[in-house]
């Protein structure tokens, strides 16, 4: 019951997180004009990953897309890439986790497969959340650097009579949305991984019983069957089972690269 709740909650938290990552990526307010030097501006500038906007006090807002790809800063391209990777991984993770949910029955899917899928989606959510947090943090760092550079320029270039107020940008709402959303996706992913660990022992115990049952029945059957099964003495049988169990644990704890394809 607790495992189902943990898995369900992990799914919901990740879903909210990924929705937030998508929202942050689409938002125009990644950086907003710093109004410290000019709090009474009649023109307000803000920028996103895809376009920059100007809102006039008249109520008119004009947005212009970044129609160039090569002319954009490498950092901006990197942030875009991180956010998109985060969204893609998160979306795949959501798809996988829907089928992995314990409360949903799909055909004759075994619990071991559900455990694998839960872990896979959990890892995907963790990576997705990290991508979003990294993307937002890189952008924030870029803003801080530019902010102090423009502040330095502002106070060194005041020699003339005419004031040229340089537009400085500070953190926009999208950054906070991105950080929170990334964190939620990360937490959701961790919860999915915890849920998977909760699923794994149940499966192992179940298999252990089945193996023991077949092992005992073999002891009473003719030798020909024994030979055909490939099991030797009881010790040999146990060793093979242990090995099988260990391999299965490894699959659950450390998915192979094929699990992501």
């Amino acid at each position: 019951m607790a495992v189902t709740a943990c898995q369900g909650l992990g799914f919901v938290v990740s879903l909210i997180g990924i929705a937030g990552i998508i929202a942050a990526t689409c938002m125009d307010q990644w950086s907003t004009q710093d109004l410290y030097n000019n709090p009474v501006t009649a023109v307000f500038n803000y920028q996103g990953l895809w376009r920059s906007c100007v809102r006039e006090s008249s109520g008119f807002t004009e947005c212009r897309g970044y129609f160039t790809l090569l002319g954009l800063p490498a950092m901006l391209q990197a942030v875009r890439a991180l956010m998109i990777v985060g969204i893609v991984l998160g979306a795949i993770g959501l798809l996988v986790s829907i089928f992995a949910l314990k409360c949903i029955r799909i055909g004759s899917m075994e619990d071991s497969a559900k455990a694998n899928m839960t872990l896979t989606s959990g890892i995907m959510f963790i990576v997705s959340g990290l991508c979003a947090i990294a993307g937002v943090s890189v952008f924030a760092n870029m803003l801080v650097t530019n902010f102090w550079m423009s502040t330095a320029n502002m106070y060194t270039g005041m020699g003339g009579m005419v004031q040229t107020v340089q537009t400085r940008y500070t953190f926009g709402a999208a950054l906070f949305v991105g950080w929170v959303a990334g964190g939620l996706t990360l937490i959701g992913g961790v919860m999915m991984c915890i849920a998977c660990r909760g699923l794994a022992p149940e499966e192992t115990n179940y298999k252990a019983v089945s193996y023991h049952a077949s092992g005992h029945s073999v002891a009473y059957k003719p030798g020909g069957f024994k030979a055909s099964t490939g099991f030797g003495s009881n010790t040999k049988n146990k060793k093979i089972y242990d090995g099988g169990a260990r391999t299965e644990d490894e699959v659950q704890s450390y998915p192979s690269k094929h699990d992501y394809v």
Epitope: T41, S52, E56, S57
Partner: antibody, heavy 119, light 113 residues
């Protein structure tokens, strides 16, 4: 057609008060910022105050700050300018105007209402 | 506050002549965000209310004759009337619409000989 009609002007004693109104029609009043601009006799234009569409931002010229209060009633499509502690230099024609256009430009202006501050 | 200085204060021209008037700002009115200058030009004919001529320093309002041209950037702006007509007799004001208070210039009075 956009129409702005000012009212409430007249003769006021120095130190007195007056409330000007501007009735708007022909556009979605609640969506646009509104301004008051005045013009003293034989003088140039002087911007007085601005109020945003939802009254979230209100700005005043330094010459009227603390004496004039700008407000609006969106359901009634009306703009108000409450003037107190009036001085002789406040004598002017008061226009209400709207930033209906791009570039914060004041495209539509009322015909103005005359305020005379004199003893 | 942004101070706008208009020159000359008055101009006397003959019909058909080309005329230019200047408006200088104490601060830059150029907005980096959209690469536009937030300066507006108005025309006020005798006994009438002001009317909008040009916004964003150089964009003519629809319906304004193309003989009116706005130019300049940053702190220096110019309004040019290519062939002055009798109906252009008016006072021309420039206005800062970049930051509050939205100051006006003192105006340039255009007279005909």
């Amino acid at each position: 057609d956009v129409q702005l009609v000012e009212s409430g002007g007249g003769l006021v004693q120095p130190g007195g008060s007056r409330k000007l109104s501007c009735a708007a029609s022909g556009f979605t009043f609640s969506s646009f910022g509104m301004h008051w601009v005045r013009q003293a006799p034989e003088k140039g234009l002087e911007w007085v105050a601005y109020i945003s569409s939802g009254s979230g931002s209100i700005y005043y010229a330094d010459t009227v700050k603390g004496r004039f209060t700008l407000s609006r009633d969106n359901p009634k499509n009306t703009l108000f300018l409450q003037m107190t502690s009036l001085r002789s230099e406040d004598t002017a024609i008061y226009y209400c105007a709207t930033s209906y256009y791009y570039g914060n430009a004041l495209e539509y202006w009322g015909q103005g209402t005359s305020v005379t501050v004199s003893s | 506050d942004v101070v706008l200085t208009q020159s000359p204060s008055s101009l006397t021209v003959t019909e058909g002549e080309k005329v230019s008037m200047s408006c200088k700002s104490s601060q830059s009115l150029f907005n980096v965000g959209n690469q536009k200058n937030y300066l507006t030009w108005y025309q006020q004919k005798p006994g009438q209310t002001p009317t909008l001529l040009i916004y964003w320093a150089s964009t003519r309002k629809s319906g304004v004759p193309d003989r009116f041209t706005g130019s300049g950037s940053g702190t220096d702006f110019t309004l040019t009337i290519n062939t002055v007509q009798a109906e252009d007799l008016a006072v021309y004001y420039c206005q800062n619409v970049y930051s509050y208070p939205l100051t006006f210039g003192a105006g340039t009075k255009l007279d005909l000989k």
